[in-house]
Amino acid sequence: LVPHLGDREKRDSVCPQGKYIHPQNNSICCTKCHKGTYLYNDCPGPGQDTDCRECESGSFTASENHLRHCLSCSKCRKEMGQVEISSCTVDRDTVCGCRKNQYRHYWSENLFQCFNCSLCLNGTVHLSCQEKQNTVCTCHAGFFLRENECVSCSNCKKSLECTKLCLPQIENVKGTEDSGTT
């Protein structure tokens, strides 16, 4: 199966790599603009230079292109707890991330919120906190995992999943009560 090509890709594929077809004259291949620049004017003829201009402050292009405008730098989402890892330059967009001891939770493919890594109190770290995943905790005896926190089995209600994990604890309590009555 031949992948479907858009009009722009079709036009570009006629020219060698690093060049694009002139929009008004399909017999001319113009050199693409370097990253950090954008297309101001197409090349006037074969072998002649494309007029590329540097992106203005607050905009960028991250790869060779024939864009008429640079792309706007993205802003880190403060309300999501994001911080700026590196600021925008003419050839690279802003890089946003989370603070130390935080991880990313993605609400969509490209929108994330920062959350604090779990400390595994009353348990041990099974897997360390990663960029996109919280710490995985293993709880000590007498505790069960609820929303990635180790909670005392005394808070385990019969209807909850924790009954299986806390059962030995409950049995032990029963056992000591029984032995006390004989």
């Epitope: 993205s74 802003k75 939770h105 609400w107 969509s108 493919e109 490209n110 929108l111 919120q113």
Partner: nanobody, 124 residues
């Protein structure tokens, strides 16, 4: 067919409380992030709150932080929004939504599915 049905809206005095519910059907509710969005009269849409599939991660807009609480009951396929200390500026139609779509850097948002909305009016 995905269906989202909100309820619980009404007229409430400033400082009062309301609890909105959203009954979901037609998809595996327990496997999806869910959202509350609102539209005030004559204004654009505002993303109010979000909760992940397990109920472990939540998001609140600054305008509602500390006053609203989002929760879900996966056994009942229901999403909730507990709204306390209500203000006149909370007056809006509240929608339950699923399937967040964002532009490249998350500046523009949209949703795949919406409910019909429930009107919340905060007035004395």
């Amino acid at each position: 067919e995905v269906q989202l049905l909100e309820s619980g809206g009404g007229l409430v005095q400033p400082g009062g409380s309301l609890r909105l519910s959203c009954a979901a059907s037609g998809f595996t509710f327990s496997g999806y992030n869910m959202y509350w969005v609102r539209q005030a009269p004559g204004k654009g849409l505002e993303w109010v709150s979000a909760i992940d599939a397990y109920g472990t991660h939540t998001y609140y807009a600054d305008s509602v932080k500390g006053r609203f609480t989002i929760s879900r009951d996966n056994s009942k396929n229901t999403l909730y929004l507990q709204m306390n200390s209500l203000r006149a500026e909370d007056t809006a139609v509240y929608y339950c939504a699923e399937g967040l779509q964002t532009s490249d850097h998350g500046e523009r948002i949209s949703f795949d599915y919406w409910g019909q909305g429930t009107l919340v009016t905060v007035s004395s």
